[in-house]
């Protein structure tokens, strides 16, 4: 004869309130004879849940028909769930007898806990932009879950990072937990179109992590190189000079030119391209007047990119005397 | 073997409290309650009470709510019965007793406690 | 409680002897009874069970009938090592209740 096992599969069952719990439990014989009843808790104060023959449990149903023969499936669906029915549940095999049936074996229990899914990560950058190779710190946040066992995962571009420090909170028992991780990430000068993800993985998540992220764009400064140079083309009486503002980020960009000091309010034609790794390129033409010049024309482009001090890039027009003399359009 | 090995006699003063063990071996402990039964000098059996070896829950005789307490240890498959405030009817001998469906199939040697003062 | 009433309370017989002991309810049992034999000194033993069955090992000289309130116990042919006291017991409800006891004596 086999021997009676009570086999409760789940060790643990992740419920959220409202919802219909599923509590498994087969046995391997149909002896001894005698009923199955499920208790939650153990000792002389557990809890009845359900006894087929006895008794009134209008939120229990059974997952099998128990009046059929060979039933060995004592499952029960327990509805409308409340944070008062956590516990651990056990499928109890009774030996019929008189004047009571006697317990005969318990099934290992199924410990029952409200599942809470964690809310949508939401990454937060650094109030300020910094420039590449320093590091920014990032925070992600997620509430409202339970367990509190979680896994947090930082991602920059797919790949993971270590730098990270995460905390659960709180520490002892509670009905909701909450995480917050601050990553630490160095910045690269292509990082204008990066970006940082933060990845939670929960059990009631069913292997499904929900992700935040974040844009290295809003985090970064890519500062300007500047280069001045003159055209070997004139116009007529007129020199053609270009600032090439390269590889900045972001857009915001203030460009003047002086010329022997003095800031040239008149309009310059010029251009802005946007480069493969999110980064600007601002040229500006100067068109410089030498038929009145002077020797001497120093012309000044001057850069305030996002807010920060303003560079500049110095050129000392090479104007010949054959150049003044000439007054065709072509250049020789 | 299948056996319930009691503890020895006892002789107690009225007043007093007794403690008597019963431990099995043999068998799935946890799979039968345990009863007692107490016969005085001469008279018949007098059913105590049971304990269920799984939960710890008990059930007592009227007679001896309150001065009875029935207890179970898993880990050595042993019950003890304790009773208090003895008086000189409760020299007995204690049977601790196995219940099949509805008998009993396996029984102690029993436990003298004489009460006396 | 439910009272368990035997009789004879004692009786002598003879080796070879049928003997039948009886046992009244107070209220049904339906066939929750079972009998004991006891020998001075000793810890009863199971004979009969659910007012019929004979349990394991024991002799075929020993039988049991009845229902509801009332039972007996048969000794077929009475041997020498039979000579004990003999209990009924229901199991229907609790508190669990034996007879007063039949005492068997040789003649």
């Known amino acids: 004869e086999e021997e009676l096992q009570m086999i409760q599969p789940e060790k643990l069952l992740l419920v959220t309130v409202g919802k219909t719990a599923t509590l498994h439990c087969t046995v391997t014989s149909l002896l001894p004879v005698g009923p199955v009843l499920w208790f939650r808790g153990v000792g002389p104060g557990r809890e009845l849940i359900y006894n087929q023959k006895e008794g009134h449990f209008p939120r229990v149903t059974t997952v099998s028909d128990l009046t059929k023969r060979n039933n060995m499936d004592f499952s029960i669906r327990i509805s409308s769930i409340t944070p008062a029915d956590v516990g651990t549940y056990y499928c109890v095999k009774f030996r019929k007898g008189s004047p009571e049936n006697v317990e005969f074996k318990s099934g290992p229990g199924t410990e029952m806990a409200l599942g809470a899914k964690p809310s949508a990560p939401v990454v937060l950058g650094p109030a300020a932009r910094t420039t590449p190779e320093h590091t920014v710190s990032f925070t992600c946040e997620s509430h409202g879950f339970s367990p509190r066992d979680i896994t947090l995962k930082w991602f920059k571009n797919g790949n993971e990072l270590s730098d990270f420090q995460t905390n659960v909170d709180p520490t002892g028992q509670s009905v909701a937990y909450s995480i917050r991780s601050t990553a630490r990430v160095v910045l690269d000068p292509w990082d204008v179109r990066s970006q940082v993800i933060c990845e939670v993985a929960h059990v009631t998540l069913q292997g499904d992590p929900l992700r935040g992220t974040a844009n290295l764009s809003e985090a970064i400064r890519v500062p300007p190189t500047l280069e001045v140079t003159q055209q070997p083309m004139r116009v007529g009486n007129q020199v053609n000079v270009t600032c090439q503002v390269r590889k900045f980020y972001p857009q915001s960009l203030q460009l003047t030119w002086s010329e022997n000091g003095n800031v040239c309010q008149r309009e310059t034609a010029s251009t802005l391209t946007e480069n493969k790794d999110g980064t600007y390129n601002w040229t500006s033409w100067f068109l410089v007047n030498i038929s009145d010049q002077r020797d001497d024309v120093v012309l000044t482009c001057q850069v305030k990119h996002d807010g920060q001090l303003a560079v500049s890039k110095r050129l000392a027009l090479e104007v010949t005397v054959h150049q003044k003399d000439q007054s065709s359009d072509a250049t020789p | 073997q299948v056996q319930l090995v009691q503890s020895g006699a006892e002789v107690k003063k009225p007043g007093a409290s007794v403690k008597v063990s019963c431990k099995a071996s043999?068998?799935?402990?946890?799979?039968?309650?345990m009863h007692w039964v107490r016969q005085a000098p001469g008279q018949g059996l007098e059913w105590m009470g049971r304990i269920n070896p799984n939960s710890g829950g008990t059930k007592y005789a009227q007679k001896f709510q309150g001065r009875v307490t029935m207890t179970r240890d898993t880990s050595t498959s042993t019950v003890y019965m304790e009773l208090s405030s003895l008086r000189s009817e409760d020299t007995a001998v204690y049977y601790c007793?196995?219940?099949?469906?509805?008998?009993?199939?396996?029984w102690g040697r029993g436990t003298l406690v004489t009460v006396s003062s | 409680d439910i009272q368990m009433t035997q009789s004879p309370s004692s009786l002598s017989a003879s080796v070879g002897d049928r003997v039948t002991i009886t046992c009244r309810a107070s209220?049904?049992?339906?066939?929750?009874l079972a009998w004991y034999q006891q020998k001075p000194g000793k810890a009863p033993k199971l004979l009969i069970y659910?007012?019929?069955t004979l349990e394991s090992g024991v002799p075929s000289r020993f039988s049991g009938s009845g229902s509801g309130t009332d039972f007996t116990l048969t000794i077929s042919s009475l041997q020498p090592e039979d000579f004990a006291t003999y209990y009924c017991?229901?199991?229907?409800?609790?508190?669990?209740?034996f007879g007063q006891g039949t005492r068997l004596e040789i003649k």
């Open positions: 017991q229901q199991a229907n409800s609790f508190p669990i209740t």
């Open positions: 043999g068998y799935t402990f946890t799979s039968y309650y």
């Open positions: 659910e007012a019929s």
């Open positions: 007793a196995r219940l099949g469906s509805a008998y009993f199939d396996l």
């Open positions: 209220q049904s049992v339906d066939t929750w």
